[in-house]
Amino acid sequence: QKPSIGKCSVDIQQNRTKTTERPDLLNCPIYWQQVQEKCLLFSHTVNPWNNSLADCSTKESSLLLIQDKDELTRTQNLIHDKAISFWIGLNFSLSEKNWKWINGSFLSSNDLKITGDAKENSCVYISQTSVYSEYCSTEMKWICQKELTLVRNKVSPDSWL
């Protein structure tokens, strides 16, 4: 069983009258790290954008979706080397002539400032300081995300010790 396949989970005490439910715990799979309500996997190896998209899918996740500038900054703060870049889940839709997230939504003009061409076969990557477009066929590291999901785990109180 692969360590990266398991779902991220939040174990929460939903019914506080039941003393056998575990207190709040946040958990991401091995190799993944928690960033607020997401589990992120920063790849070590490299892939074209489409292969990165597929790899995240096999891990029951998606390429990173960035909601706002704050999330971009939080993610960039986890990139410790200026020379390293990561694909995210944003590419150029030729038919709609706009940047499109893999969830189907379009890039809002005030979300991210992308340096580079907006044209066919352009995909977006982030570095420590910036957001760029590049040919989707370029091999790069990538970031997968999983949304944290709610799980109720009942355990005996003495296992909290």
Partner: antibody, heavy 121, light 107 residues
């Protein structure tokens, strides 16, 4: 069955060439970066080279840079190591290895049996 | 390159003994350390990955700990089949590097 099977080793003179092959089966070969690792007789493990899943990115240990070339044919599920200008110190068992996760270069959970390369006059 | 220094280079122990092997990295590697077991004439076998995660099928007497630069592999109760050579390996950055190995011998 999930396995890796190396071939192509043998006895070669210093300055000569050999091409090693590693046939993969039982897993999605093209989605994994692959590596060659070697072990000289009675010595420890030494990573030699790695290649990305689609084959466009390669890395080499300093000791083999400029002499060895790693490649792959995903249509044949096969990994290669072309070894030129061989030296006595390249004598070793050569293993191909697959990482545990498709996002990694290392943490090798699958190894071949190895193929022995002997460089001697 | 990141150097990994294993100690001891060899250890003599008896069945049932607790054996501890250490691996020190020349710079911080977070938890990106794996441990392998190798027997003569055989390929290495992954025991522990990401410093402390037990690989599928590996007995629970094997455990790993540590982060940053200092790591430990512990065999809680040595069994006859555990006499072998053990290697640490870092997966933090390329080039991938291995420790020099620790041979666990019968006392």
């Amino acid at each position: 069955e999930v396995q890796l099977l190396e071939s192509g080793g043998g006895l070669v003179q210093p300055g000569g060439s050999l091409r090693l092959s590693c046939a993969a089966s039982g897993f999605a070969f093209s989605t994994y970066a692959m590596s060659w690792v070697r072990q000289a007789p009675g010595k420890g493990l030494e990573w030699v080279s790695a290649i990305s899943g689609v084959g466009g990115t390669t890395y080499y240990a300093d000791s083999v840079k400029g002499r060895f070339t790693i490649s792959r044919d995903n249509s044949k599920n096969t990994l290669y190591l072309q070894m030129n200008s061989l030296r006595a110190e390249d004598t070793a068992v050569y293993y191909c290895a697959k990482p545990l996760d498709s996002s990694l270069w290392a943490d090798f959970d699958l190894w071949g049996r190895g193929t022995l390369v002997t460089v001697s006059s | 390159d990141i150097q990994l220094t294993q100690s001891p280079s060899s250890v003599s122990a008896s069945v049932g003994d607790r054996v501890t092997i250490t691996c020190r990295a020349s710079q911080g590697i977070s938890s990106w350390l794996a441990w392998y077991q190798q027997k003569p004439g055989k390929a290495p076998k992954l025991l522990i990955y990401y410093a402390s995660s037990l690989q599928d099928g590996v007995p629970s007497r094997f455990s790993g700990s540590g982060s940053g630069t200092d790591f430990t592999l512990t065999i809680s109760s040595l069994q006859p089949e555990d006499f072998a050579t053990y290697y640490c390996q870092q997966a933090s950055v390329l080039p991938i590097t291995f420790g020099g190995g620790t041979k666990v011998e019968i006392k």
